[in-house]
Amino acid sequence: DVNEAPQFSQHVFQAKVSEDVAIGTKVGNVTAKDPEGLDISYSLRGDTRGWLKIDHVTGEIFSVAPLDREAGSPYRVQVVATEVGGSSLSSVSEFHLILMDVNDNPPRLAKDYTGLFFCHPLSAPGSLIFEATDDDQHLFRGPHFTFSLGSGSLQNDWEVSKINGTHARLSTRHTEFEEREYVVLIRINDGGRPPLEGIVSLPVTFCSCVEGSCFRPAGHKHHHHHH
């Protein structure tokens, strides 16, 4: 009966962590089993940046220094599983640490929303849908933005309601708007750590319409119609 080396559960272990993670944070773990049932001791090899330590018994991996995404991501090290006792046979796997952006990008509009209009006069309150985004990386789920009007003075004329984590609806509260452009300020919060907020402007024009399009003198482009 030949003694066999420990067997890792995966060829490569991968973990993702924010680059601003606190020192001492658990960033991942590895697991191996010994065919003979012997205990296993884990160690790291090739941690040239000195960022990591491994719990020899559990295989949990912790940060021991500040992580710097600019140094290059992913950061790859080898993990060694060695039998305790017996022939001290060992196996090698890899641990890849992918460093994520910190939440450092405020929300913004996902598209260019110039050219929004309603036909004047409004026959009934109208609404339009807009989308927000940011340039941060979102793990497990997409962004979860919250939306509100950017100033209190807008609340007599407008209301904003969340549709989902990225989309919201801007609605008129009445039909008594002048025939001109209104700039509606929207406050978008990303709920991140730390939470970042962006104030964006949606320019909405109330204009006379011809065949469902905003009437403009020659040389002006038609605007997009929203209900």
């Epitope: 060829h11 090739g46 040239t48 991501s73 950061y75 790859r76 090290v77 890899e94 793990l139 497990f140």
Partner: antibody, heavy 119, light 113 residues
Framework: QVQLVQSGAEVKKPGASVKVSCKAS????????MNWVRQAPGQGLEWMGA????????NYNQKFKGRVTMTVDTSTSTVYMELSSLRSEDTAVYFC????????????WGQGTLVTVSS | DIVMTQSPDSLAVSLGERATINCKSS????????????LAWYQQKPGQPPKPLIY???TRESGVPDRFSGSGSGTDFTLTISSLQAEDVAVYYC?????????FGGGTKVEIK
């Protein structure tokens, strides 16, 4: 065997958005990263970004950040790439490409989707 | 970002002769943590997606003929076709898979002389 089947060719106007799909089969979908690589006519290859279907983590090429969005539907093993604010220089063939076993080279490729941006 | 520079831009080789393509990286692609070079090579024929040939600088993808070999370490890498066949006419690209963002060389067009 591994198969990546992409959606058909698209013609878009400048300023519009395009959404390309890539349906994967023949392997455990959540075990491998999916990348998007584009190739302008007569030009070389350019990596746009990648998504890990296991947790929806995305890593975008800075050049496309703010214009590209990669999403995944694990129920259908499909990855999507949406590119917004299109301009004529975005005319290219867009490929999805699965990561390799244990690392990040491109082991399997879709057939490509031609996106033409023209007014 | 890591810049990958290929040479030559094009190469004409007689059938049965050796073709050599070079790829130079602006950063070291040898990981001191794993002792692997994170460099891949691809072959692309007109109207087709690229096909992987080599990864980790010298590991051949399954099904790739053994006339294709990769060598080099650190910043300088080579793809060698030991005996060029007609079906090897294509554009060849190197790619680093060491650090995000993954980047490609500009390509080398291989033709028959």
């Amino acid at each position: 065997q591994v198969q990546l089947v992409q959606s058909g060719a698209e013609v878009k106007k400048p300023g519009a958005s395009v959404k390309v799909s890539c349906k994967a089969s023949g392997y455990t979908f959540t075990d491998y990263w999916m990348n998007w690589v584009r190739q302008a006519p007569g030009q070389g290859l350019e990596w746009m970004g990648a998504i890990d279907p296991s947790d929806r983590y995305t890593n975008y090429n800075q050049k496309f950040k703010g214009r590209v969005t990669m999403t995944v539907d694990t129920s259908t093993s499909t990855v999507y790439m949406e590119l917004s604010s299109l301009r004529s220089e975005d005319t290219a063939v867009y490929f999805c490409a699965r990561g390799g076993y244990g690392d990040y080279w491109f082991a399997n490729w879709g057939q490509g989707t031609l996106v033409t941006v023209s007014s | 970002d890591i810049v990958m520079t290929q040479s030559p831009d094009s190469l004409a080789v007689s059938l049965g002769e050796r073709a050599t393509i070079n790829c130079k990286s602006s950063q070291n692609l040898l990981s001191s943590g794993t002792q692997k070079n994170y460099l891949a090579w691809y072959q692309q024929k007109p109207g087709q997606p690229p096909k992987p040939l080599i990864y980790f600088a010298s590991t051949r993808e399954s099904g790739v003929p053994d006339r294709f070999s990769g060598s080099g370490s650190g910043t300088d890498f080579t793809l060698t076709i030991s005996s060029l066949q007609a079906e090897d006419v294509a554009v060849y690209y190197c790619q680093q898979h060491h650090y995000f963002p993954w980047t490609f060389g500009g390509g080398t067009k291989v033709e028959i002389k």
